[in-house]
């Protein structure tokens, strides 16, 4: 059997660190057997069998010029093997971050904090953190660790399914290369990393007969589980074309009627979502949707209890967002809360 331990990585490759002494091992001989060493493609002897180093070649203070393939052979000239030297660095602790788009699952991504220059893999696992009594030193088997399944195709991401919203988790991402391993531990709670996906299906429609109104509607993101006890609240922004500043409101449901649109101008609208109890952070903004108020005139309204004149639409101040109000149902259809303000009627 070979005297050379097979480091993780492609076969026939051995590894070292620049600036350090590197030992190459001749794979096809018995440990301690004296061998001769050559650089592949160079006939001069690098190290003879009389070196006293047996089956190993020692390169002092290796540098990039030492990278390449080496040939070792036994005393009678038999090929002991070819060895490729690759230089690089041991792993450093990877940079790890975790995020959750819903309250049942979360994913963690990682990247190297230093480039090692060597073949690298990552071991990913997690466990549930529990507060144990002072008399208990053992870790409960129900707390893990469990593997964090990695995405296929080498994407630097793993996903924990079926997480508990109120639990704390410790994520272990270990960077492994042929020169060693380095671990990053990250404590996460779903509450702090929750960031929903943006709302979907945003539509902006004019309100016939109201030249300063637009109705925006949207749906929950598809990634948000349809269960009634974890709801989302929303933030809506809108602005007329060529206008630099956004106006912001927090709708009560999945629809909002804008009452201070600029007549005749197209408006951009976008929405964002967040857990209704303020866990985590706001989602990114949805893609913008556009709509233009209708050009029709305002109809006279004759309520049953008397002749009213509808006030002309007045642009209210909406620079500061309204106080947050949770959407208490996943898919409510609510009237805009400012309709009563906008349509104040006065007696003739």
């Amino acid at each position: 059997s070979s005297p050379c331990p097979q480091a993780w990585g492609p076969p026939g490759v051995q590894y070292g660190q620049p600036g350090r002494s590197v030992k190459l091992c001749c794979p096809g001989v018995t440990a301690g057997d004296p061998v001769s060493w050559f650089r592949d493609g160079e006939p001069k002897l690098l190290q003879g069998p009389d070196s006293g180093l047996g089956h190993e070649l020692v390169l002092a203070q290796a540098d990039s010029t030492d990278e390449g393939t080496y040939i070792c052979q036994t005393l009678d000239g038999a090929l002991g093997g070819t060895v490729t030297l690759q230089l690089g660095y041991p792993p450093a602790r990877p940079v790890v971050s975790c995020q959750a788009a819903d309250y049942e699952n979360f994913s963690c991504t990682w990247s190297p904090s230093q480039i090692s220059g060597l073949p690298t893999r990552y071991l990913t696992s997690y466990r549930k953190k529990t507060v144990l009594g002072a008399d208990s030193q053992r870790r409960s088997p129900s707390t893990g660790p469990w593997p964090c399944p990695q995405d296929p195709l080498g994407a630097a991401r793993c996903v924990v399914h079926g997480a508990e919203f109120w639990s704390q988790y410790r994520i272990n991402v270990t960077e492994v290369n042929p020169l060693g391993a380095s671990t990053r531990l990250l404590d996460v709670s779903l509450q702090s990393i929750l960031r929903p996906d943006p709302p979907q299906g945003l539509r902006v429609e004019s309100v016939p007969g109201y030249p300063r109104r637009l109705r925006a509607s949207w749906t929950y993101p598809a990634s948000w589980p349809c269960q009634p006890h974890f709801l989302l609240k929303f933030r809506l922004q809108y602005r007329p074309a060529q206008h630099p500043a956004w106006s912001t409101v927090e709708p009560a449901g999945l629809e909002e009627v804008i009452t201070d649109a600029v007549a005749g101008l197209p408006h951009a609208v976008r929405v964002s979502a967040r857990d209704f109890l303020d866990a985590g952070t706001w989602s990114t903004w949805s893609p913008e949707a556009w709509g233009t108020p209708s050009t029709g005139t305002i109809p006279k309204e004759i309520p049953a209890w008397g002749q009213l004149h509808t006030q002309p639409e007045v642009e209210p101040q909406v620079d500061s967002p309204a106080p947050p109000r949770p959407s208490l149902q996943p898919h409510p259809r609510l009237l805009d809360h400012r309709d009563s303000v906008e349509q104040v009627a006065v007696l003739a």
């Epitope: 050559f38 160079e42 006939p43 002897l45 003879g48 009678d76 000239g77 038999a78 090929l79």
Partner: antibody
Framework: QVQLQQPGAELVRPGSSVKLSCKAS????????MHWLKQRPVQGLEWIGN????????HYNQKFKDKATLTVDKSSSTAYMQLNSLTSEDSAVYYC??????????WGQGTLVTVSA | DIVLTQSPATLSLSPGERATLSCRAS??????LHWYQQKSHEAPRLLIK???QSISGIPARFSGSGSGTDFTLSFSSLETEDFAVYFC?????????FGQGTKLEIK
Amino acid sequence: QVQLQQPGAELVRPGSSVKLSCKASGYTFTNYWMHWLKQRPVQGLEWIGNIGPSDSKTHYNQKFKDKATLTVDKSSSTAYMQLNSLTSEDSAVYYCARGDYVLFTYWGQGTLVTVSA
Amino acid sequence: DIVLTQSPATLSLSPGERATLSCRASQSISNNLHWYQQKSHEAPRLLIKYASQSISGIPARFSGSGSGTDFTLSFSSLETEDFAVYFCQQSYSWPLTFGQGTKLEIK
């Protein structure tokens, strides 16, 4: 014991080619390099190139790069050297030699190649 | 290419005498020099490798020395079967090259 068997002689026409053989026995063929050498009375010994029988990796003397092609047949433990576009300058004794990367430890008896019309 | 120059071209000595053959390289080749013996109508035979390392089965009266550019093959006491042609060979760089040979003949 190690043996390298080569034909004694080859008579060839100018401009033609010849494929010399070297059948190895008495050792594991794929464990050792096989070298080919040329010897003429005045010019002495010249190294043509070598081949690693396990992976057919070759090194050639640039002088012979366009003249010689080295191959092996592992199944029959035989090394070959093809010489093309022969001229009188190619008349010589050609040796195969088992060796390590750069040394010639065991030699065949040589094949005398005569290029003549 | 590295050129190896052997001297003398011919050396005439008697059995029992000591003999010294020389090989000079056109550039420094460390100890990457080897010696071969070739008798008439025979293939060459490796005698010494890497300037001074002996080869199994070769009589102890053959020895080698030298490093860099100057190398020597020595015979402590010539035997009748030692009269032959001797070649040096370098393995410092491609192509592997030989000296032109020294013929050791009986006086």
